[in-house]
């Protein structure tokens, strides 16, 4: 039968290239069965992950999976870095892989990428 353990579906070494000044939503895909777990986001600082206490978060429920969202309103240059979501479930702590945000301020970038370029050449943003 299907496992009822909580699972967090952030892919290993996942990355997002984003622009300072824009709104952005960082999603933590959460799979659970009966009771929705308590989920938090933290930002990696060396070997420790600092809990993001005062940040706006929300849940988005879909048919087979839920998303715990960290809102960037808007993205700031110092949001650059790696993030991890964690779930408390039946006294167990489940941690996701880290996901990295590469933040570029286009005013300091060598060129301003178009929407199409961002889709096809994300490396433009953090070279």
């Amino acid at each position: 039968k299907e496992s009822c353990d909580v699972q967090l579906y952030i892919k290993r070494q996942s990355e997002h290239s984003i622009l300072a000044g824009d709104p952005f939503e960082l999603e933590c895909p959460v799979k659970y069965c009966a009771n929705r777990p308590h989920v938090t986001w933290c930002k990696l600082n060396g070997t420790t992950c600092v809990k993001l206490e005062d940040r706006q978060t929300s849940w988005k429920e879909e048919k087979n999976i839920s998303f715990f969202i960290l809102h960037f309103e808007p993205v700031l240059p110092n949001d650059n870095g790696s993030y991890r979501c964690s779930a408390n479930f039946q006294s167990n702590l489940i941690e996701s892989h880290s996901t990295t945000l590469y933040v570029t301020d286009v005013k300091s970038a060598s060129e301003r990428p178009s929407k199409d370029e961002m889709a096809s050449r994300p490396w433009l943003l953090y070279r």
Epitope: L19, A20, G21, D22, P23, E73, P74, L76, P77, N78, D105, V106, K107, S108, R112, P113, S114, K115, D116, E117, M118, L125
Partner: antibody, heavy 119, light 107 residues
Framework: QITLKESGPTLVKPTQTLTLTCTFS??????????VGWIRQPPGKALEWLAQ???????RYSPSLKSRLTITKDTSKNQVVLTMTNMDPVDTATYYC???????????WGQGTLVTVSS | DIQMTQSPSSVSASVGDRVTITCRAS??????LAWYQQKPGKAPKLLIY???GLQSGVPSRFSGSGSGTDFTLTISSLQPEDFATYYC?????????FGPGTKVDIK
């Protein structure tokens, strides 16, 4: 060079809906980091940020006015439209269209259009 | 919302004077602050971004400093064209908010 120009009615009656159009040139709203927004200024008073639309299509509104505001873009026409419902005399102000690139500092402004709300 | 306050609300000064305007945020905004100049009947003009960055084309007599909650705009030697109203604006979080303005007029 970048220019923005506001157009719309100069006089609206209370309870009516205001529709303002910002027509711009010198940039594209599909370029990374660009945003076009609206800021207003009642006569003799301070500036108030109303709404902004981003190159991604994301929209953000002033929480105090969110229920009355809608911002849309027509990238092919280089236009951004703001609608504001249920106008009241306190909404009398000069309405400015703005451009931002990257962080949300408004580096280009339209000349502004004065909208008076009166019966 | 982040509230922005400015002081003084008005200042009378002479050509050549050094003028300092302060802006305070109700919570920390790092250095995500801009300063604008507005003349009667005209749109505001961006002077300073990111607390201390001088916008292209703005004379070097304008400078900005500060971070966190307290910020300063300084005009090192006031020129006749500088008589105007100055506004600060935080870009740290939605909704973006402006200070009430500081009017610089002729003494």
């Amino acid at each position: 060079q970048i220019t923005l120009k506001e157009s719309g009615p100069t006089l609206v009656k209370p309870t009516q809906t205001l529709t303002l159009t910002c027509t711009f040139s010198g940039f594209s709203l599909s370029t990374g980091g660009v945003g076009v927004g609206w800021i207003r200024q009642p006569p003799g008073k301070a500036l108030e940020w109303l709404a902004q639309i981003f190159w991604t299509g994301d929209k953000r509104y002033s929480p105090s006015l969110k229920s009355r505001l809608t911002i849309t873009k027509d990238t092919s026409k280089n236009q951004v439209v703001l609608t504001m419902t249920n106008m009241d005399p306190v909404d009398t102000a000069t309405y400015y269209c703005t451009h931002k690139l990257g962080m949300n500092y408004f580096d280009y402004w339209g000349q502004g259009t004065l909208v008076t709300v009166s019966s | 919302d982040i509230q922005m306050t400015q002081s003084p609300s008005s200042v009378s000064a002479s050509v050549g004077d050094r003028v300092t305007i302060t802006c305070r945020a109700s919570q920390g905004i790092s250095s995500w602050l801009a300063w604008y100049q507005q003349k009667p009947g005209k749109a505001p003009k961006l002077l300073i971004y990111a607390a201390s960055g001088l916008q292209s084309g703005v004379p070097s007599r304008f400078s900005g400093s500060g971070s966190g909650t307290d910020f300063t705009l300084t005009i090192s030697s006031l020129q006749p064209e500088d008589f105007a109203t100055y506004y600060c604006q935080q870009a740290n979080s939605f909704p973006f908010t402006f200070g009430p303005g500081t009017k610089v007029d002729i003494k």
